[in-house]
């Protein structure tokens, strides 16, 4: 027998430097949690222990601090260079700053192979990326060769930027016949390594013969055996087992996100390859495990220019952008127009003739906003003011419901209405009239909702059992602010940009902004 | 396949400036940086810098940086060294490499400068 | 600079024979090492980066092993045509800095 140890992080999402226990800004250092300079301590005294050791990441290191905003990729490729990982898996978020943005930064600088089976390139972009991702690598491990084939969302073109020269294939119809090649190779130990979301790896793990392990990522699942040492709350036991088509039992593994766990599977192989045992566990990494004292020092160097970032201008306002509470949870805010149509113009993707954007649809709680910015400081915007107003490190994100789900939504925003509460809704592309003299729950007189289905965008009245796409922060989507029904009832949830970085690269393309109060939200009742 | 052509062998004055080239084929020349390595006789090898193609962007040994100017011309797909102020000890057989996960892979077959007065 | 010290300078072996050769950092270079082949007049030709990995077509009796500090090459049967001179380098950072190389003879 011939055991290998496969350490694997995903959904890292730019949190090089430790965070709260919440994934947040860290701020009581003897609390926090994650970070590069901590991962790398846990897995040098792994490697160092144990003889046959992989480290992987199933994609999704792009995206989601201001350490992204700055250096755009470059401190992925650096840092996971730092640790030495041994192959990535491309995510959604690589994608966020078009196929240039991924070339540039990242493929070209990593030293270590980035994967990806189901992402084909075409037209001139086909030679320009040929040899930067792979869709597999063959690995020596110790006196062994291991297989790793890798996988991406076939959703990316709606989640992010990729462009029209990169075709998404299904994931099954792609991996298998690498797998197959992989096998002609004499390669008998093969690890699938992508970033479709836990139902897809299940899949994966089901679909495609040869494959003896799944290494996954994009819907943050927290896998754990026994008792979570954290807040997460576990999906399944560590490694959830699938049983294949041809009966094998297929080890399937995720750790969660943002760089709080550090996946640790034990892997026993036979002489044939065949998959005899699997065990582990994430490793939580908390202050208990110290961070790598040269790691921390690189972090101090590059987190210099962070600082010197903060404090520049991304564009001005010439309107005062109303984030009080006063207004946000009561009426319709200028802040909350602004941050929706941020969000909008953040997903646009012209992905089919029919439609002028896959989404056309923003909610947006009122509470999340928690401050103003004054015009009267020569207009300017910093990335500073922003963290002010969104200071929650969260993101925003894409979600299918029902009109059913939406009218919920809508009637929860005023169902104890007059109280300062946070769940009041600021909206885009919505049109809400509410009624208070009514009772709670049939205070919604009139809900219109933007067309997508049409080349001149005009209001609707919205559909129960119609599907929608809707933008919105990741904190309502997990069913924040009592909105329960959202996250029963969503029908599919991506995760999306950081928030800051959203509405600050909207700012910056804007250059002036004026949002104003223009009738998005009305009461019908005189008082109001 | 992969085919890094360097230009003929050069004899040069003290003083003088010499420029190198690498003529790149079978891949797309922007996709990958390229190293410039030297190797002097009886010494080791010296690794004097590396150029991004696509956009010009350059790192240099710090003993060569004064002296040593990388460029490209992407339309031809050729890669350059240019070396000012030649002496002696500059007479070495200076190679081109292809970056592949940050190492050289690729190698020209090399051109001999000779420095003699 | 990274030292990198390569031992033996030179070797004489014979065809079939199994040979190693060590290469040595002055500081830890985090596995980022690559070995390369010159026989005279040709151009060098890479065999293994990252310690381990072999490049395309290169041959599998070549095969490396390390890490930190102290680094391995491996011919398991040397051929007539794997008599060359053997150089180390590592791209751990700049600058890359090469071994003194070892050269292996015919016995």
């Known amino acids: 027998a011939w055991e290998l140890t496969i350490l694997h992080t995903n959904d890292v999402h730019s949190r090089l430097e430790q965070t709260s226990e919440d994934s947040s800004k860290c701020v009581n250092a003897s609390r926090c949690m994650g970070g590069v300079a901590r991962l790398f301590t846990k897995v040098q005294q792994i490697r160092r222990a144990e003889p046959n050791v992989l480290l992987l990441d199933a994609g999704d290191q792009y995206q989601g601090t201001i350490w992204f905003t700055v250096y755009k990729g470059a401190e992925v490729a650096h840092f996971m260079n730092a640790l030495r990982y041994d192959a990535m898996a491309l995510g959604n978020h690589e994608f966020d700053n078009g196929v240039e943005g991924l070339i540039e930064p990242l493929l070209k600088e990593a030293k270590f192979p980035i994967l990806s089976a189901n992402i084909k390139a075409k037209g001139p972009l086909a030679s320009q990326i040929s040899g930067l991702y792979l869709p597999y690598k063959v690995l020596p491990v110790g006196d062994e060769v291991v297989g790793i084939v890798g996988y991406t969302s076939k959703e990316t073109p709606f989640l992010s930027n990729p462009g029209t020269n990169l075709v998404f294939e299904d994931e099954i119809t792609a991996l298998q016949p690498e797998v197959d090649k992989l096998k002609t190779l004499n390669v008998n130990k093969i690890i699938a390594l992508g970033h479709s979301g836990f139902e897809m790896d299940k899949l994966i793990a089901q679909k495609v013969r040869g494959v003896d392990v799944v290494v996954g990522g994009h819907s943050n699942t927290f896998l754990y055996t026994g008792n979570p040492p954290s807040k997460e709350v576990p999906a399944g036991k560590y490694p959830f087992i699938v049983t294949s088509d041809d009966g094998r039992k297929v080890p399937v593994v995720q750790a969660y996100a943002f760089g709080k766990y550090l996946g640790y599977l034990k892997i026993e192989f036979d002489e044939r390859g065949n998959v005899i045992s699997s065990h582990g566990n994430p490793i939580l990494l908390n202050s208990s495990i110290p961070e790598d004292p040269s790691i921390k020092a690189d972090i101090n160097k590059w987190r210099i220019k962070l600082d010197n970032y903060s404090t520049q201008e991304l564009g001005k306002t010439i309107v005062y952008l109303d984030g009080s509470s006063q207004s946000c949870r009561f009426r319709e805010c200028n802040m909350g127009n602004l941050i929706c149509d941020a969000m909008i113009n953040n997903n646009l993707r012209h992905t089919d003739e029919m439609f002028w954007n896959h989404v056309s649809m923003c909610i947006l709680n009122g509470g999340g906003i928690r401050s103003p910015i004054d015009e009267r400081n020569n207009g300017t915007i910093t990335w500073e003011n922003l963290a002010a107003v969104l200071p929650f490190g969260g993101t925003f994100d894409l979600v299918q419901l029902k009109g059913s789900t939406l009218k919920k939504a809508f009637e929860h925003s005023v169902h104890r209405y007059g109280q300062s509460t946070g769940e009041f809704l600021q909206v885009g592309g919505i049109h809400v009239v509410y009624d208070l003299s009514r009772k709670p729950g049939d205070r919604v007189v009139k809900l219109d909702v933007l067309c997508t289905k049409c080349r001149v965008p005009s209001y609707d009245p919205l559909k129960m059992d119609e599907v929608y796409k809707v933008i919105l922060p990741n904190f309502l989507a997990n069913g924040g602010d009592g909105f329960q029904m959202i996250k029963d009832e969503l029908l599919r949830h991506d995760s999306g940009d950081q928030d800051i970085n959203v509405v600050s690269t909207y700012i910056s393309k804007m250059k002036v902004i004026y949002p104003a109060v223009e009738g998005r939200i009305k009461f019908s009742t005189g008082s109001h | 396949q992969v085919q890094l052509v360097q230009s003929g062998a050069e004899v040069k004055k003290p003083g003088a400036s010499v420029k190198l080239s690498c003529k790149a084929s079978?891949?797309?020349?922007?996709?990958?940086?390229m190293h410039w390595v030297r190797q002097a006789p009886g010494q080791r090898l010296e690794w004097i810098g590396n150029?991004?193609?696509?956009?010009?962007?350059?790192k240099y040994n710090e003993k060569f940086k004064s002296r040593a100017t990388l460029t490209v011309d992407k339309s031809a797909s050729t890669a350059y060294l240019e070396l000012s102020s030649l002496r002696s000890e500059d007479t070495a057989v200076y190679y081109c490499?292809?970056?592949?996960?940050?190492?050289?892979?690729?190698w020209g077959q090399g051109t001999t400068v000779t420095v003699s007065s | 600079d990274i030292q990198m010290t390569q031992s033996p300078s030179s070797l004489s072996a014979s065809v079939g024979d199994r040979v190693t050769i060590t290469c040595r950092a002055s500081?830890?270079?985090?596995?980022?090492l690559t070995w390369f082949q010159q026989k005279p007049g040709k151009a060098p030709k890479s065999l293994i980066y990252r310690t381990n990995i072999l490049l395309d077509g290169v041959p599998s009796r070549f095969s490396g092993s390390g890490s930190g500090t102290d680094f391995t090459l491996t011919i398991s049967s040397l051929q007539p045509e794997d008599f060359a001179t053997y150089y180390c380098?590592?791209?751990?950072?700049?600058?890359?800095?090469f071994g003194g190389g070892t050269k292996l003879e015919i016995k």
């Open positions: 079978g891949y797309t020349f922007t996709s990958y940086w």
């Open positions: 150029i991004n193609p696509s956009n010009g962007g350059t």
């Open positions: 490499a292809r970056r592949d996960y940050g190492s050289p892979s690729y």
């Open positions: 500081q830890d270079i985090n596995s980022y």
């Open positions: 380098l590592q791209y751990h950072e700049f600058p890359v800095t």
